[in-house]
Interface confidence: low
């Protein structure tokens, strides 16, 4: 009784059901409405992408399918694609007339044409696949399990995004936000229609709010004739080069090799390639703790059913505010204040004596010469934990960004200043903050030793 898992082009649970022949209101009025919508609303500035959905549906159905055509599978597939597209843009379309008109129109057409909600779609950017049960059916097309090939077939290039988690822990989201978080316990990093990543973070020192990743679970969901459901689990001192069932690929299906684990460095560095969703994951053990990095197409990132619950998924939305450690608030207080004076003024104990500020800076500079947020994270972690391995964690996290991030101009992130409105208004680049401000928040994190 394995619960069903949604697959790539299958419509989600949210939404409507096909109601059978003749069950709905006449949908003929929808077509003029669609034409009107396509022509009437300026598309350039709105974050709501409903016009794109309308256009794709229009092009998928124009010519071969008249509005009153028979209940063809192709037409239903186009409708399902249209529905999928509207769900993806739902979050940015609330209150949008074109969006709501489209949604109601789809419901009418689905009903009138006896289309079931599950089944193949004709989404040009996604593989047109059979419905997603646990079908073992072999595919004639080797491209089904190769995301990039499928994209290029439609003369499109996927937009890739990156997310990483390392150190104390520091999170770089799919939108290139950089946060330092508490997030003790189990937290979902990614949860979309194709995979789920959960991390468990534990305190680095007794009584400390600073945590690091001690366990990582990745679930690759059953997908068409490509892969069986596979679970990968890593823990401190155990970085396996196989899924929990002992296999190193996607199972027994036709496209099983579209999911593959490669051990780069025994017990220290594993890479998982999920070609069927264009995704690469890097898991490392650095010192006692784990780091995670992923490269994933935007389309896969956004393939979620319930946008309202997306605040839970760290890679997409970042850490909840109450879990964030705000560097910037402390930067302002820290301007011109020496690290020693800051530490002395604090009732909390300083970091271990073996790690003075100068040493932390020197060790981080050695590995991370650019004073970006990775460098700041490194210094923060060394002063918080006294564990030199966090230097390597930051270093490898940046190395993984270099390998996985599609925009080479965004490798280094700098903290934006908040007190230079004139500079920002003039369109000038925002200056990186000096490192010093990173010292203050760690004082609150240091354990209290009695």
């Amino acid at each position: 009784m394995q619960p069903p898992r949604e697959r790539l082009v299958v419509t989600g649970r949210a939404g409507w059901m096909g109601m059978g022949r003749g069950a709905g209101r006449s949908a003929l009025g929808f077509w003029p409405t669609l034409a009107f919508l396509l022509c009437s609303f300026p598309a350039a500035t709105s974050p709501c992408k409903i016009l794109k959905c309308n256009s794709e549906f229009w092009s998928a159905t124009s010519g071969s399918h008249a509005p009153a055509s028979d209940d063809t599978p192709e037409f239903c597939a186009a409708l399902r694609s249209y529905a999928l597209c509207t769900r993806r843009t739902a979050r940015t379309c609330r209150g949008d007339l074109a969006y709501h008109s489209a949604v109601h129109g789809i419901e009418d057409l689905m009903s009138q044409h006896n289309c079931s909600k599950d089944g193949p779609t004709s989404q040009p950017r996604l593989r047109t696949l059979p419905p997603a049960g646990d079908s073992q059916e072999r595919s004639d097309s080797p491209e089904i399990c190769h995301y990039e090939k499928s994209f290029h077939k439609h003369s499109a290039t996927p937009n890739y995004t990156h997310c990483g988690l390392f150190g104390d822990p520091h999170l770089r989201t799919f939108t290139d936000r950089f946060q330092t978080c508490k997030v003790q316990g189990a937290w979902p990093l990614i949860d979309n229609n194709y995979l789920n990543v959960q991390v468990t973070n534990t305190p680095v020192l007794p009584g400390s709010a600073a945590t690091a990743t001690s366990k990582l679970t990745i679930i690759f969901k059953n997908f068409q004739e490509c892969v069986d459901q596979k679970v990968y689990q890593a823990e401190m001192d155990e970085l396996p080069a196989a899924f929990v069932d002992g296999s190193k690929n996607g199972g027994d299906k036709h496209g099983a090799n579209s999911l593959k684990i490669t051990e780069k460095v025994s017990g220290q560095h594993v890479e998982i390639q999920a070609k069927y969703i264009g995704t690469t994951i890097v898991v490392r053990q650095v010192g006692r703790y784990l780091t995670f990095a992923v490269r994933m197409p935007e389309e896969v990132v956004n393939a979620v059913e319930d946008w309202d619950s997306q605040g839970l998924y760290l890679c997409l939305r970042g850490c909840p505010l109450n879990q964030q450690i705000d560097f910037q608030a402390f930067h302002t207080n820290a301007e011109g204040t020496g690290a020693r004076r800051l530490a002395a003024a604090s009732p909390a104990p300083t970091a271990p004596e073996t790690f003075p500020y100068e040493t932390a800076v020197a060790k981080c500079k050695e590995k991370l010469p650019v004073e970006d947020l990775y460098y700041q994270a490194c210094v923060f972690d060394l002063l918080t934990t006294g564990d030199v391995n966090f230097t390597l964690a930051a270093y490898y996290a940046l190395e993984d960004v270099k390998m996985l991030h599609s925009n080479k101009d965004k490798l280094h992130l700098y903290e934006r200043t908040r007190d230079l409105p004139g500079r920002a208004a003039a369109g000038l680049p925002l200056a990186p903050r000096p490192l010093l401000g990173a010292l203050v928040p760690l004082l609150a994190l240091l354990p209290v030793f009695c």
């Epitope: 189990a186 959960q198 679970t217 689990q233 155990e238 396996p240 069932d245 839970l312």
Partner: antibody
Framework: EVQLVQSGAEVKKPGASVKVSCKAS????????ISWVRQAPGQGLDWMGW????????NYAQKLQGRVTMTTDTSTSTAYMELSSLRSEDTAVYYC?????????????WGQGTLVTVSS | QSALTQPRSVSGSPGQSVTISCTGT?????????VSWYQQHPGKAPKLMLY???KRPSGVPDRFSGSKSGNTASLTISGLQAEDEADYYC?????????FGGGTKVTVL
Amino acid sequence: EVQLVQSGAEVKKPGASVKVSCKASGYTFTSHGISWVRQAPGQGLDWMGWISPYSGNTNYAQKLQGRVTMTTDTSTSTAYMELSSLRSEDTAVYYCARVGSGPYYYMDVWGQGTLVTVSS
Amino acid sequence: QSALTQPRSVSGSPGQSVTISCTGTSSSVGDSIYVSWYQQHPGKAPKLMLYDVTKRPSGVPDRFSGSKSGNTASLTISGLQAEDEADYYCCSYAGTDTLFGGGTKVTVL
């Protein structure tokens, strides 16, 4: 058909140990974790811990640390739960359950339960 | 005392809807996507009804649905039927332990 079949009822004296078995069939044993859950008479469900048959990794409920041991035998697709230093409050029906996916997910298939009675 | 709080009992007539709440902390429910619900008939093993807050395993009727708001997860049974009379338990993974609620007895009047 996916099934978990548990060993029969046990009667133990306080201070003794009990070992309950759970034989899995109908699926790849190493692909899913096994959780153990107990239920005292007239009470609710109480999670005891989890084991990965593939790696042997375990995670025990904090209140049972030191008293519970979970093991598996992949050659026979059997999971075991041993509870030591038994007390009368350990009298309960003990269930094994297959974990749907990952270590902390839903339990989608359950054994029929094993009644353990601790009485002097 | 369970870390997840459920009402001891709820009741409804056939065809009505009943909702069972499951209240915890931000870490046990609020920030968790791993809330599941189990049905248990007297003398029987529990049965999975919902997982990941809202998802329904195959074979579970669609009158069972789940939701979450803040630190409270809910199971709703719409169109109550006689066979729905049972105990229902919520469950959540919270950091290191998996927690069960105390259980709710659903009575069909």
